[in-house]
Interface confidence: low
């Protein structure tokens, strides 16, 4: 009598998440008389998967009624597949008697789930930093299977080289996680960038998935500070300008101080934006030189995004006036830059 | 480094058969989708299809399926164009081409490309 | 099938000029788009995929643009090695389609 034969003709079956996987099983010969049982894994720990005379098995269906006569196919469906399920499964064919006795396994069919990596999060630096710095952002998603897949990021459209990429676990799992870290080199003109962490996988059959985050989130452009003085009044008052350009964020505060000592401070808001997403802005100081003996030192102080003070001073010389009205004499810019810190 | 590298010119007569191979090299050939396209002297990009070389399976662009056929070599690395019943019209340069996307089993936009292959079918 | 229909089909220009290729698809295509460049005797090389962003390799003065129907290749500065034919190709419909070409030669 030939040799019973227990035939899974797939070595692997790869099914999607939420789909159904068919396991296939067929017999040789319908003797010996005894049942067939479904395992995963092999050996003393292994798990029942069907077993068509005992047990509740919800999730699992025969593929043709085993309980026909001749029925030689005993395939399985097991629906609503997740990563968990993942492992190989092992057709067993039985000797009925009592117990019933193994006779012969199937080579095993290893089934592996595909699931969809997450949406990607990418996440920026806790503190801003400013042009010529590089600044690490970071991109993570979870929960695909199998383990192959690729990452990318861009800066406005230019792929990054310098990158650092893991997935995790090494080993074998149900699903696995990647971890990314890119590190951008800040420029002046970033306030408008956007860094894309870009994954592909075999579960997604089109464009790969996308996490954004904006450099605005990132970076710091410190002010360029200019004090000016225009012509003296009819009325002995210099109107003098600070002129704080190209900064962001927007947060900056403005303290003037006449030889020393606080005479106005303002705080920015709601200015326009310029085209490279900097922000401007002009202060004015008035000056009364016919209440002034000496020279009038004036500094604009400005404090951006929580930094160091940046002051740039000018001497208005008053010593040099007459004080009768209608003197249009030009003070002197000294420019000193007391402190200057970009 | 990443390149695939096709098989050299081909001369055939009509209604002979040819198998063009393109052999990837600098990453596993199962990764990444296999296109084919095809350049007649003097024209345009024409896609003839691709292979999942995850599965296997062959999608046909609509002139192309009946004599043409996709296939796989995995152990070799190597993609495989055979044409079968050879006509004038069939000379051309033919190309193997990278999918972009990593897994990206849905054609897509190409990365790398063979060099070529000139088939030429003339009696 | 879509078609897709590339503007002008050939350029004349010169080392330094800047040039704009157009490439138009009959249907929406998102931005599954990408350009290719060719040389005669030569493979395609892929420039740009999903409508702007440039392969790793590929020169900042290539940039493309647009969604939907509408497309454009930017070279902003010519250098002599560029003149070559360029496609542009959709890949959100099957099957995948290239323009005719738009062959860019030294004025």
């Known amino acids: 009598e030939e040799e019973l034969q227990v035939i899974q003709p797939e070595k692997s079956v790869s099914v999607a998440a939420g789909d159904s996987a068919t396991l296939n099983c067929t017999v040789s010969s319908l003797i010996p008389v005894g049942p067939i049982q479904w395992f995963r894994g092999a050996g003393p720990g292994r798990e029942l998967i069907y077993n068509l005379k005992e047990g509740h098995f919800p999730r699992v269906t025969p593929v043709s009624d085993p309980t026909k006569r001749n029925n030689m196919d005993f395939s399985i469906r097991i629906s609503n597949i997740t990563p968990a399920d993942a492992g190989t499964y092992y057709c067993v064919k039985f000797r009925k008697g009592s117990p019933d006795v193994e006779l012969k396994s199937g080579a095993g069919t290893e089934l592996s789930v595909r699931a969809k990596p997450s949406a990607p999060v990418v996440s920026g630096p806790a503190v801003r930093a400013t042009a010529e710095h590089t600044v690490s952002f970071t991109c993570e998603s979870h929960g695909f299977s199998p383990r192959d897949i690729t990452l990318k990021w861009f800066k406005n459209g230019n792929e990054l080289s310098d990158v650092q990429t893991n997935v995790d676990p090494a080993g074998k799992s149900v699903s696995y996680s990647i971890r990314s870290t890119a590190r951008v080199v800040l420029t002046r003109r970033d306030v408008h960038s956007q860094v894309i962490c870009e994954v592909a996988h075999v579960t997604l059959q089109g464009d790969p998935l996308r996490g954004t985050a904006n450099l605005s989130e990132a970076i710091r452009v410190p002010p360029f500070l200019e004090v000016t003085q225009q012509s003296m009044r009819a009325d002995n008052q210099v109107n003098v300008t600070c002129q704080v350009t190209k900064f962001y964020p927007q947060r900056l505060q403005l303290t003037w101080l006449e030889n020393g000592n606080v005479s106005r401070t303002e705080m920015a808001s709601a200015l326009p934006e310029n085209k490279d997403g900097t922000y401007n802005w002009t202060s004015w100081l008035l000056v009364n030189v016919s209440a002034h003996r000496d020279d009038v030192k004036l500094t604009c102080q400005v404090e951006h995004d929580g930094q160091p003070a940046v002051n740039k001073s000018f001497s208005v010389k008053v010593s040099a006036h007459p004080k009768e009205q209608g003197s249009n004499t030009a003070a002197e810019n000294t420019g000193t830059n007391e402190r200057n810190i970009y | 480094q990443i390149q695939l590298v096709q098989s050299g010119s081909e001369l055939k007569k009509p209604g002979a058969s040819v198998k063009v191979s393109c052999r990837a090299g600098?990453?596993?050939?199962?990764?990444?989708?296999m296109n084919w396209v095809r350049q007649a002297p003097g024209q345009g990009l024409e896609w003839m299809g691709f292979i999942n070389t995850y599965t296997g399976e062959p999608t046909y662009a609509q002139g192309f399926k009946g004599r043409f056929v996709f296939s796989l070599d995995t152990s070799v690395s190597t993609a495989y164009l055979q044409i079968g019943s050879l006509k004038a019209e069939d000379t051309a340069v033919y190309y193997c081409a990278r999918t972009r996307g990593y897994y990206d089993f849905d054609g897509g936009a190409f990365d790398y490309w063979g060099q070529g292959t000139l088939v030429t079918v003339s009696s | 099938d879509i078609q897709m229909t590339q503007s002008p089909s050939s350029l004349s220009a010169s080392v330094g000029d800047r040039v704009t290729i157009t490439c138009r698809a009959s249907?929406?295509?998102?931005?599954?788009l990408a350009w290719y460049q060719q040389k005669p005797g030569k493979a395609p090389k892929s420039l740009i995929y999903s409508a702007i962003y440039r392969y790793i390799g590929v020169p900042s003065r290539f940039s493309g643009s647009g969604s939907g129907t509408d497309f454009t290749l930017t070279i902003s500065s010519l250098q002599p090695e560029d003149f070559a034919t360029y496609y542009c190709?959709?890949?959100?419909?099957?099957?995948?389609?290239f323009g005719q070409g738009t062959k860019l030669e030294i004025k």
């Open positions: 600098g990453y596993t050939l199962t990764d990444y989708a």
């Open positions: 190709q959709q890949y959100n419909t099957y099957p995948l389609t």
């Open positions: 249907q929406n295509v998102g931005t599954h």
